[in-house]
Interface confidence: low
């Protein structure tokens, strides 16, 4: 907006109240201890047009509606949405004075949502889409993801639940070792009318710590007129791509699909290779011929003991007093090792070792050569699928009026902040700066260069 | 290893109740929900019911609904479902199910990866 | 009757390619997700297919599932003498509220 150049010398001017040099408790009495940097909160305002705002900093709910709708897919007593919501600071705020809106309860379902300042209409503005999320205590099972919900004229936000029609779902998602950041837009088939969810592909990037690491971390969903799509962590790209190519199902179905009244011909020949059919048995191959013969070229060891056995009665043996010939039939002593074989090479019959045939050569098989029938794997005929639509211009998807939060977790204290949702990435960008920049800025502030950074961060303003 | 382990066989005769367990290890059962399918002889699929581990909260199938009660003992981490007024067209084999994956709508409550054995329950005067 | 309908037979021969359809309304395949489920005799169903076309890790992508409008489909491509078993569709129905299957399709793999 015009007034756009005037805001870089107020956020400067800003910046001095922001960063201001305290000396702690120890300083005062070690002049050798430099003063720490502290920031100070002040609460982002909108540098343009808006459709959608809230920093939470009133210290109030109002503008959220909370949901007394029943869930529709449990028992009446047990499916309200009973999960309590509170804006407060967080736990370990380093920025008193910075509200949010915090999940407070575990293992309920959560509802609340709020009216945009007007729809967004998909046209020719691009849609971005940004708030921050502090799992202050952790996630074990549960989403912060949001909902922009459907401009239909049903829609009524005191009865918002889980199926309340949405046109665009975004956001973070974890339960066990699955972490999730959720992109999903319903589309609606243009042939049928009937919406279908569209997932985008999962992001390369490790999403784990932004999960675990107890840091806000800022989420943001930027969706262009030419279809493409962009989601940042902290600023940071961690997955893009295009409506029309990288999404599940596929915005667009195949143009063709297999015939399903197609059949394989009964004589298609799907056989690469067969057996020669001109081949013939050689006359010298002995197909009876064993794989194994006794080694002819052995001698018997010296020393073998022919007449020995291996195994002989055990001579300290005795019969037990109490064996019965009748019942227990004609006592034998148990067998032991011969110990005349222990210094011998070998006791007993002397067999030849077996060795391979030099002759064998089992069963003839006709070798394989190139099935001059072969057609190929047969694949039935592709057809015009019936079903065929092509929506080339999928950004246009169903305008939405209301923002919403229905969740469920099994973990307390999740904190909201800085919701924000405009058609101008500059605006989205200084709110961002100016309110999860802060917090970024305090969970830093003992580290050199975090107030150059700042400053640096208000000059690059146009 | 994740699995799901059912009580044994049971023979009852009309009119009374059954009460099936499901013993689940190897995950967070309070992070699942679980449901439990039947299939009489010869016949296809029925769905139940469901249970959601983490709160316990519960729903039914229209066609069951006053006769099943579905349970659960987080520190047993075990689910009960328990079918009351048997009949003979009763006589089924009852299996727990868990989902694939997580306790919301759009986490799709019909995608079962986890199965019971399987619990034969007959009905017969 | 099943809310999903299904063939009751499909059959097809070593290397083949075969396809289940199964058929529903806006209230259940029209609106929700489609799942399938492989059972072999005297075991507990195998989820083969999850959101209409997605597999589940270690199942082979000889399946493949699909879905258009009402109706659902199930494909085996290079078709085996183990993938002998009854097939099952699935979905939740809204006028319901509930998860209806369908009556199964045995599949036969001939010679």
């Known amino acids: 907006h015009d007034g756009h150049d005037d805001d870089a010398i107020d956020i400067e001017d800003d910046l001095d109240d922001v960063i201001e040099e305290v000396e702690d408790s120890k300083s005062k009495s070690d002049a050798s201890t430099p003063p720490s940097p502290k920031v100070t909160y002040k609460a982002p305002v909108p540098t343009g047009e808006v459709y959608f705002a809230d920093s939470f900093d009133r210290g109030s709910l109002s503008g959220w509606i909370l949901s007394k709708a029943k869930k529709d897919d449990t028992d009446d007593e047990i499916a309200k949405y009973d999960g309590k919501w509170e804006v407060d600071e967080m736990k370990e705020t380093k920025l008193p004075g910075d509200k949010g809106l915090v999940l407070m309860s575990r293992a309920k379902h959560h509802a609340i949502s709020a009216k945009l300042n007007k729809p967004f209409l998909f046209d020719t503005k691009p849609l971005i889409v940004q708030y921050e999320v502090n799992f202050q205590n952790g996630i074990e099972c549960g989403g912060a993801y949001v909902k922009l919900l459907s401009k239909t004229a049903e829609l009524s936000l005191d009865q918002f639940h889980d199926k309340t029609p949405y046109t665009i779902m975004f956001g973070p998602d974890k339960c066990g070792e699955d972490y999730k950041l959720h992109f999903i837009f319903r589309h609606k088939n243009p042939k049928t009318g009937v919406y279908e969810e569209k997932h985008a592909k999962r992001p390369d990037a490790d999403l784990k710590t932004y999960f675990t690491d107890k840091k806000t971390h800022l989420y943001t969903l930027i969706l262009n007129p030419d279809n493409s799509f962009e989601i940042l962590v902290d600023q940071s790209v961690v997955n893009s791509g295009n409506l029309l190519n990288d999404m599940t199902p596929p915005v667009n179905p195949s143009r063709e699909i297999e015939d399903p009244e197609d059949r394989k011909p009964e004589d298609w020949d799907e056989r690469p290779k067969i057996a020669d059919p001109d081949a013939v048995k050689p006359d010298d191959w002995d197909e009876d011929a064993p794989s194994k013969i006794p080694d002819e070229e052995a001698t018997k060891p010296e020393g073998w003991l022919d007449d020995e056995p291996e195994y002989i009665p055990d001579p300290d043996a005795e019969k037990p007093e109490d064996w019965d010939e009748d019942m227990d039939g004609e006592w034998e002593a148990p067998q032991i090792a011969n110990p005349k074989c222990e210094s011998a090479p070998g006791c007993g019959v002397w067999q030849r070792p077996m060795i391979d045939n030099p002759n064998y050569k089992g069963k003839w098989k006709p070798p394989m050569i190139d099935n001059p029938n072969y057609q190929g794997i047969w694949k039935p005929r592709k057809i015009p699928n019936p079903d065929f639509f092509e929506d080339l211009e999928p950004f246009k998807m169903t305008p939405f009026s209301a923002i919403g939060l229905e969740l469920w977790s099994m973990t307390s204290d999740i904190f909201f902040d800085n919701f924000i949702i405009s058609g101008d990435r500059r605006v989205v960008d200084d709110w961002a700066n100016d309110g999860w920049g802060l917090k970024k800025a305090a969970d830093g502030a003992a580290e050199p260069g975090v107030v150059l950074q700042m400053l640096e961060a208000a000059e690059e303003r146009p | 290893e994740v699995q799901l382990v059912q009580s044994g066989a049971e023979v009852k005769k009309p009119g009374a109740s059954v009460k099936v367990s499901c013993k689940a290890s190897?995950?967070?059962?309070?992070?699942?929900?679980m449901h439990w399918v039947r299939q009489a002889p010869g016949q296809r699929l029925e769905w139940m019911g469901w249970?959601?581990?983490?709160?316990?909260?519960?729903k039914y199938s229209q066609k069951f609904q006053g006769r099943v009660t579905i349970t659960r003992d987080t520190s047993a981490s075990t689910a009960y479902m328990e079918l009351s007024s048997l009949r003979s067209e009763d006589t089924a084999v009852y299996y727990c199910a868990r989902v694939l994956h997580v306790l919301r709508y759009f986490d799709w409550p019909g995608a079962f990866d986890i199965w019971g054995q399987g619990t034969t329950v007959t009905v017969s005067s | 009757q099943s809310v999903l309908t299904q063939p009751p037979s499909a059959s097809g021969t070593p290397g083949q390619r075969v396809t289940i359809s199964c058929s529903g309304s806006s209230s259940n395949i029209g609106t929700n997700y489609v799942y399938w489920y492989q059972q072999l005799p005297g075991t507990a169903p195998k989820l083969l297919i999850y959101?209409?076309?997605q597999r589940p890790s270690g199942v082979p992508d000889r399946f493949s599932g699909s879905k258009s409008g009402t109706s659902a489909s199930l494909a085996l491509s290079g078709l085996r003498s183990e993938d002998e078993a009854d097939y099952y569709c699935?979905?939740?129905?809204?006028?319901?509220?509930?998860?209806?299957f369908g009556g199964g399709t045995k599949l036969t793999v001939l010679g």
């Open positions: 249970i959601n581990a983490g709160n316990g909260n519960t």
């Open positions: 699935a979905a939740w129905d809204d006028s319901l509220s509930g998860l209806v």
């Open positions: 190897g995950y967070t059962f309070t992070s699942y929900a």
């Open positions: 959101i209409n076309d």
